[in-house]
């Protein structure tokens, strides 16, 4: 007769490993009992079960409670028995050995690796501004049995680096993503994929950039200066910009305050029907925590009983 | 016939020793687990010791841990049970018994007493 | 250590009778359960091995079952000679344990 088991068993964390043993043997041949060790090198032998043909299983106290054998029906000449809930300090080598009746005894070894899952996690870099050079984006960390892969899943421009902190059952890898900020990164999607073969998929970790900027500000409105005159209604000046975060936007009057009945909201300046006293200059004042811009424009109400109109002056500053 | 007999027994005080020896016959000695069993008077059966067939592991009941030692020569064919810093408590016949041999090289576990020999008295007072 | 608890402590019975002794164990032993017949005097004698198997020579009324933690010694028909008293025994652990016994007595 020969023993039939496997080289190697692999189990994920928490699982039950079930470590084959079987006798083929010739007919009229008995198993009398299949004793089960496991035998690391450099170690002792340690005993794990005992599968008896008489007396039953007999579970060492080091595992009681976590070895069984399998469910029925059952060969006689199967000696494989179940470990029940795998951890890390299972991993290493078995040894089942028969006694039959009348070929004498066999052994066998197998080995069994203990694969442990990677729980990833992804932290964010500093801050990321436009005019920053070579920033860290986001870092991506992971630790498994065998040393997890970490990858990155993204249509922005960078460059990645990786390292490898060996324990010692497991590895942690730690990937960076390093990028040149800009506004059009702003939204985008940065993924950090874990493969291993713990995992039925690849685990991913998806984390939406913020670039902050803000843009040149400019103002809206007076396009065709000859709407601006004496008695019109619903005159108003719009700010341009945008920024991240989203920018706030003051009005104030270069040569004094405002006029009354002017309204301020938000980026728009609304006007009551205009009267000769609404000419001036206007500075829009745009601002987030990243940077502030000013836009100014100068009004002229156009008198109509007057035969000629007025230029109209738009200057931008930042 | 499987024959044990034990010998070595008596009166002694507290806090004495004595030796018990057990001669075996009658089988391969060195092929067997050998095993001391006492028994207090009047009262049931308590599991003293064992020693593996070639002598490599020995196991003691906590009642005699320490004070207790089992050893066997192969040569002889005998079993031996030596017994220092005695007690009132430690009053019992003792048998010694050889464990059934159909477990092979594994030590968790114990296997039944086939054969038992007819028991020394040890009596331990002052 | 592992307890094994018998009952009853003691039973009269007459010759003929079918006579039943229970061992149950506080954990699992599976089948590593031995039952012992000892006459006063006497050393004790093993009957029954593995829970259920018997021992050469002894007379098959004697028999045993039960797995796990609770089993059973059943004596068909009570023998003159069958008057002891009886104990069961784990060698499922080091150490070893036995019953407290049980007393088996002409009515």
């Known amino acids: 007769g020969e023993l039939e088991t496997s080289d190697v068993v692999t189990v994920v964390l928490g699982q039950d490993a079930k470590l084959p043993c079987f006798y083929r043997g010739d007919s009229g041949e008995q198993v009398g009992q299949v004793a089960w060790a496991r035998v690391d090198a450099g170690e002792g032998a340690q005993e794990l079960a005992l599968l008896h043909s008489k007396y039953g299983l007999h579970v060492s106290p080091a595992y009681e409670g976590r070895v069984e054998q399998p469910p029925p029906p059952r060969n006689p000449l199967d000696g494989s028995v179940l470990l029940r809930n795998a951890v890390q300090a299972d991993e290493g080598e078995y040894e089942c050995r028969v006694s039959t009746f009348p070929a004498g005894s066999f052994q066998a070894r197998l080995r069994l690796r203990v694969l442990v899952p990677p729980l990833p996690s992804l932290n964010p870099g500093p801050a990321l501004e436009e005019g920053q050079g070579l920033t860290l984006a986001a870092s991506c960390t992971a630790e498994g049995s065998p040393a997890p892969s970490v990858t990155w899943d993204t249509e922005v421009k960078g460059t990645t680096s990786s390292r490898s902190f060996k324990h010692s059952r497991s590895a942690a890898v730690t990937s960076e993503f390093h990028l040149v900020p800009s506004r059009s990164m702003n939204g985008q999607p940065l993924t950090c994929v874990v493969s291993h073969p713990g995992l039925l998929q690849d685990q991913r970790i998806t984390h939406i950039l913020h670039v902050s900027f803000l843009a040149e500000a400019s103002v809206r409105g007076l396009e065709d200066q000859n709407l601006w005159h004496i008695g019109r209604e619903g005159a108003m000046l719009k700010c341009l910009s945008e920024g991240q975060p989203p920018p706030s936007y003051n009005w104030t009057r270069l040569d004094g305050p405002l006029p009354s009945g002017v309204r301020v909201d938000g980026d728009t300046l609304g006007f009551p029907p205009l009267t000769t006293e609404h000419s001036g200059i206007y500075v829009c004042h745009v601002s987030n925590e990243f940077s502030s811009r000013d836009s100014q424009v100068t009004v002229d109400v156009l008198d109509p009983q007057e035969d000629s109109g007025k230029q109209v002056d738009l200057v931008s500053a930042s | 016939e499987v024959q044990l007999v034990e010998s070595g027994g008596g009166l002694v005080q507290p806090g004495g020793s004595l030796r018990l020896s057990c001669a075996a016959s009658?089988?391969?000695?060195?092929?067997?687990?050998m095993s001391w069993v006492r028994q207090a008077p009047g009262k049931g059966l308590e599991w003293v010791s064992v020693?593996?067939?070639?002598?490599?592991?020995?196991f003691y009941a906590d009642s005699v841990k320490g004070r207790f030692t089992i050893s066997r020569d192969n040569s002889k064919n005998t079993l031996y049970l030596q017994m220092n810093s005695l007690r009132a408590e430690d009053t019992a016949v003792y048998y010694c018994?050889?464990?059934?041999?159909?477990?092979?090289?594994?030590?968790?576990?114990?296997?039944?007493?086939?054969?038992w020999g007819q028991g020394t008295l040890v009596t331990v007072s002052s | 250590d592992i307890q094994m608890t018998q009952s009853p402590s003691s039973l009269s019975a007459s010759v003929g009778d079918r006579v039943t002794i229970t061992c149950r164990a506080s954990?699992?032993?599976?089948?590593?359960l031995a039952w012992y017949q000892q006459k006063p005097g006497k050393a004790p004698k093993l009957l029954i091995y593995?829970?259920?198997s018997l021992q050469s020579g002894v007379p098959s009324r004697f028999s045993g079952s039960g797995s796990g933690t609770d089993f059973t010694l059943t004596i068909s028909s009570l023998q003159p000679e069958d008057f002891a008293t009886y104990y069961c025994?784990?060698?499922?652990?080091?150490?070893?344990?036995f019953g407290q016994g049980t007393k088996v007595e002409i009515k």
């Open positions: 009658g089988f391969i000695f060195d092929g067997y687990d």
């Open positions: 018994a050889r464990e059934y041999s159909d477990v092979v090289d594994y030590v968790s576990v114990r296997t039944p007493l086939d054969y």
């Open positions: 025994q784990q060698h499922y652990t080091t150490p070893p344990t």
């Open positions: 954990q699992g032993i599976s089948s590593y």
């Open positions: 593995a829970a259920s």
């Open positions: 020693i593996k067939d070639h002598g490599g592991y020995k």
